[in-house]
């Protein structure tokens, strides 16, 4: 059993400075080139080694870019989005959505908050069951008094 894969979504403002080879990443997506089904958003497909984005370190492959210099990237054709990046100037402000994959279940990665690696529901279910049994026993005992 693989467990369920969830995503932790965070947003970040990233200010990038254009380098000799541009901003140093490639994009996919757009209304005419959907990268994710039912989502015409713009995504980072590749970060170029030694480029501006790679050396900055914050942008990651798979990130969704929500805006460039405050301009929303919703409902844009792919080429229009490309042009927007190309004409964005020297210092570029990107609003970015990171999606961190979090796996729940038996083979989930052991995170800092879960040192034993036991999924939280496996702890909560027995605790809840014991509480219910105790409550039922108490109520029954009270009725006998």
């Amino acid at each position: 059993m693989n467990g369920r894969v969830d995503y932790l979504v965070t947003e970040e403002e990233i200010n990038l400075t254009r380098g000799p080879s541009g901003l140093g990443f490639n994009i996919v997506g757009g209304t005419d080139q959907q990268y994710v089904s039912n989502d015409s958003g713009i995504y980072v497909s590749r970060i170029k080694e030694n480029g501006a984005a790679a050396l900055d370190g914050r942008l990651q492959e798979g990130d969704k870019i929500l805006s460039v210099n405050g301009q929303d990237l919703k409902n844009l054709l792919h080429q229009d989005a490309v042009d927007l990046f190309r004409n964005a100037g020297y210092a570029v402000s990107l609003r970015v959505q990171h999606r961190l994959q979090v796996q729940n279940g038996p083979i989930g990665h052991r995170g800092e908050g879960d040192p034993s690696g036991i999924p939280i529901f496996m702890v909560l279910v027995p605790v809840f069951a014991l509480t219910m049994v105790a409550a039922w026993a108490f109520m029954r005992y009270r009725q006998q008094l």
Epitope: I47, N50, A53, A54, L55, G57
Partner: nanobody
Framework: DVQLVESGGGLVQAGGSLRLSCAAS??????VGWFHQPAPEKRREVVA?????????YYTHFVEGQFTISRDNAKNTVYLQMNSLTPEDTAVYYC????????????WGQGTQVTVS
């Protein structure tokens, strides 16, 4: 064990210069960056970074022409030359490194204080 040790910080008058050093040990890195944190409640921001292999550099627009990042492979050290310093450059400067070519920096130094009066 990975270690990044910064040095060279201190108090300097406006208009002056400082050279920060970051001595790296424990492994070969792909990238090394210098970050600054002007106040504890503010986040660390990259000011300059360098590719260990190619020597390609990156600067944020507000320090380009003022700061210079360089590396000495023989000494396993990365430098940040800071010129024409202003009070706005006052911050704790951190060295960070990664053995991956992209993504977040995984290793951090303890930081060195730079104060411009």
């Amino acid at each position: 064990d990975v270690q990044l040790v910064e040095s060279g910080g201190g108090l300097v008058q406006a208009g002056g210069s400082l050279r920060l050093s970051c001595a790296a040990s424990g492994r070969t890195f792909s990238r090394v960056g210098w970050f600054h944190q002007p106040a504890p409640e503010k986040r660390r921001e990259v000011v300059a970074a360098i590719s260990w292999r190619s020597g390609d550099t990156y600067y944020t627009h507000f320090v380009e022409g003022q700061f210079t990042i360089s590396r000495d492979n023989a000494k396993n050290t990365v430098y940040l030359q800071m010129n024409s310093l202003t009070p706005e450059d006052t911050a704790v400067y951190y060295c960070a490194a990664s053995d991956k070519s992209t993504g977040p920096y995984e290793y951090w130094g303890q930081g060195t204080q730079v104060t411009v009066s």
